[in-house]
């Protein structure tokens, strides 16, 4: 049997050591003890007696099935306790009585059916994070379960086999910053929602099949809900249940952000928000994020005209990796307040982008992200986007463009352009001179000779440049990142010719450690202030005797340098 390894500050690691019991020889000097991934099965009343100053105890996945009632009695300083993924089929309040300093408690993934016969947590007045429940057996939430807890930063409840929710069970916690609920279906959703309306600021619903969700008015008085964010992850919706969910929004008037992540819509987008009051109550929602939305019949999807009015005040929309091939012109025109639009990892092509960015589309748009779509022509893309009079930032990275032409048109206010990972081999005057930030990293560039008078930041890492670009091309450059190219040297003159340069990241290049380069680095201790990844990323590639040495440490041979 292996032993614990402890460092000088009392942090002890005993993970995966095949322990079959809590190891002996524990001391008061220990501050943190991790015994995860062992086969401990049992914790006796004296096993942790000596650990009076322990602040962190991690016992996850250690096959524990029995803990004596007073096993933790000496752990009054404990702040973090992780008992997740063990074999505890029942929980005892006597474990937690002495743990008055506890801030974090994870009981998730143990096969209990309830949280015990009496309240577990009345003494845990400092608790900030609580994780409970499991996938298969946790079936009942009762009113006594959360007694004594008044405020939590994070509460995560995995109740994927829930059969009974006693109303008002969650109401006793007056303030919950982030509640994550894993519910397999919507049976108790309305009851739970009513109980958390006045306490939860961010509600995250996971793995819930909402296909049969039906709204009914909540038994609550006029309530001012603090909820600002609502997220659905791994949920299933239909057109009908989406309409029903919208009706919940009348109770959360301060909601500003809605997120759908990895959800499935078994519908066609035939939404019909019947309640006209829903429209006005969506008024404060500024951010809508949709990622990996799976629509089995996406090719029959509606034009969403029924929800146009819902989204008129939204400022930020992300629809990522969801097979979007068109935002209809009339929809774009309705998005009057939209400032940020991210359509990464979709199926947009120039022909449909032209319809999406029609005259009057997205009139307030400042940032457009079209990364990893199916755009091919930089010239066409720029031309299509001329309608966006307020566009300052464009990301068209990870599209495979045809060679760049000599001239292109771009929205006149554009200041930021991301062309990284687009396969470009040459930069031409197609790139607008108005730019302040240009990202051309991860391409096939072996030179850069474009005059950009306003450029402040140039990102050109992972290319094939052999030298730093000429400083006269960028008179106001502040930041250049040119890692992982084929740069072999830089000199005092080169760096000095960038009058405003504050940050240069040039590590992981093929430096030839010549007398000149090494004497320059030795004579210039101030390099550390400008080279952000200095000295560890600056290694000699040649001559062979210095290969792999840091520039900072390499010493030129007297013979070579004084011939």
């Amino acid at each position: 049997q292996e032993s614990l390894s402890c460092d000088a500050s009392g942090v002890c690691d005993g993970r995966s050591r095949s322990f079959t019991s809590i190891p002996s020889g524990l001391t008061a000097a220990m501050k943190s003890l991790d015994l995860s991934f062992n086969k401990i099965t049992y914790i006796g009343h004296g096993d942790l007696r000596a650990c009076a100053n322990l602040q962190v105890l991690i016992l996850k996945s250690s096959r524990i099935n029995t803990i004596e009632g007073d096993a933790f009695y000496s752990l009054g300083s404990l702040e973090h306790l992780d008992l997740s993924d063990n074999h505890l089929s029942s929980l005892s309040s006597s474990w937690f009585g002495p743990l008055s300093s506890l801030k974090y408690l994870n009981l998730m993934g143990n096969p209990y059916q309830t949280l015990g016969v009496t309240s577990l947590f009345p003494n845990l007045t400092n608790l900030q994070t609580l994780r409970i429940g499991n996938v298969e057996t946790f079936s009942e939430i009762r009113r006594i379960d959360f007694a004594g807890l008044t405020s939590l930063n994070e509460l995560e409840i995995k109740a994927l086999s829930l059969r009974n929710y006693q109303s008002q069970s969650l109401k006793s916690i007056r303030d919950i910053h982030h509640l994550t609920l894993h519910l397999s279906e919507s049976a108790f959703l309305l009851e739970i929602f009513a109980d958390i309306l006045s306490s939860v600021r961010y509600l995250e619903l996971r793995d819930t099949n909402l296909a049969r969700f039906q709204f009914s008015p909540l038994p609550v008085d006029e309530v001012s809900s603090p909820m600002k964010k609502l997220a659905f992850r791994g949920s299933v919706l239909t057109d009908e249940s989406f309409n029903e969910l919208l009706k919940l929004l009348r109770y959360i008037l301060e909601l500003s952000e809605v997120e759908f992540d990895d959800c499935t819509l078994n519908g066609l987008g035939d939404f019909n928000p019947s309640e006209s009051d829903v429209v006005s109550e969506l008024g404060k929602v500024e951010t809508v994020t949709i990622r990996r939305l799976h629509i089995p019949q996406f090719y029959l999807f509606y034009d969403l005209s029924t929800v146009y009015s819902l989204l008129e005040k939204v400022k930020r929309i992300t629809v990522e990796n969801s097979k979007v091939f068109l935002v209809p012109c009339s929809f774009s025109q309705h998005l009057k307040s939209l400032e940020f639009l991210d359509l990464s990892e979709n199926l947009m092509v120039e022909e449909y982008l032209k319809n999406s960015a029609c005259k009057g589309a997205w009139p307030s748009l400042q940032t457009l992200v079209l990364s990893q779509n199916h755009l091919r022509s930089m010239q066409k893309t720029g031309e299509i986007l001329l309608t966006l009079k307020n566009l300052t930032s464009l990301d068209i990275s990870r599209n495979t463009f045809h060679p760049m032409p000599d001239s292109c048109q771009w929205p006149e206010k554009m200041r930021f352009l991301n062309l990284s990972s687009t396969g470009i081999r040459v930069v031409k005057t197609c790139i607008p001179q108005t730019l302040e930030v240009l990202d051309v990293s991860n391409n096939n560039l072996d030179s850069f000779s474009l005059f950009l008078p306003r450029l402040q930041e140039l990102y050109i890492s992972r290319n094939k440049l052999k030298t730093l670009p000429d400083a006269s091309l960028f008179p106001v450059l502040l930041v250049m990142k040119i890692r992982e190219n084929a740069v072999s040297t830089f000199s005092k003159d080169q760096l000095g010719s960038f009058p405003k340069l504050e940050t240069l990241e040039a590590g992981d290049n093929h430096f030839v450690c010549s007398c000149e380069l090494l004497s320059f680095t030795m004579e210039t201790p101030a390099l550390a202030q400008i080279l952000v990844d200095w000295p560890d990323s600056y290694l000699c590639d040649s001559p062979p005797r210095l290969h792999g040495h840091r520039l900072q440490d390499a010493r030129p041979s007297v013979l070579e340098c004084h011939q």
Partner: nanobody
Framework: VQLVKSGGGGLVQAGGSLRLSCAAS????????MGWFRQAPGKEREFVAV????????DYAASVKGRFTIARDNAKNTVYLEMTSLEPEDTAVYYC???????????????WGQGTPVTVSS
């Protein structure tokens, strides 16, 4: 959906590995949550692992967490269970199941495979 073909089971020594697979017929495979359950001789059927429709969420019984991995390939209509560091206590008949709900409760699964025996010898 019909769970038509299970395979990959057999006899293995303690510490060894196996990969179970379960293939479905029909075009609606990606609309189902998939789970693996097991039943040892003389014992009740118990939950092993579950995966959501896209493969983005997975959950495991505490007894297998860190040793078993569930995965799915919607293009091949197949769900897998990669089992490593096998122990004699893992000996059981393993069943795949399809349902509408992401849960470890076997009663919520509507479609079941025929079962694959796994024997782990010490």
């Amino acid at each position: 959906v019909q769970l038509v073909k299970s395979g990959g089971g057999g006899l293995v020594q303690a510490g060894g590995s196996l990969r179970l697979s379960c293939a479905a017929s029909g075009r609606t495979f990606s609309r189902y949550v998939m789970g693996w359950f097991r039943q040892a001789p003389g014992k009740e059927r118990e939950f092993v692992a579950v995966i959501n429709r896209s493969g983005g969420s997975t959950d495991y019984a505490a007894s297998v967490k860190g040793r078993f991995t569930i995965a799915r390939d919607n293009a091949k209509n197949t769900v897998y269970l990669e089992m490593t560091s096998l122990e004699p206590e893992d000996t059981a008949v393993y069943y795949c199941a399809a349902g509408e709900y992401y849960t470890g409760s076997s009663s919520r699964y509507d479609h079941w495979g025929q079962g694959t025996p796994v024997t782990v010898s010490s």
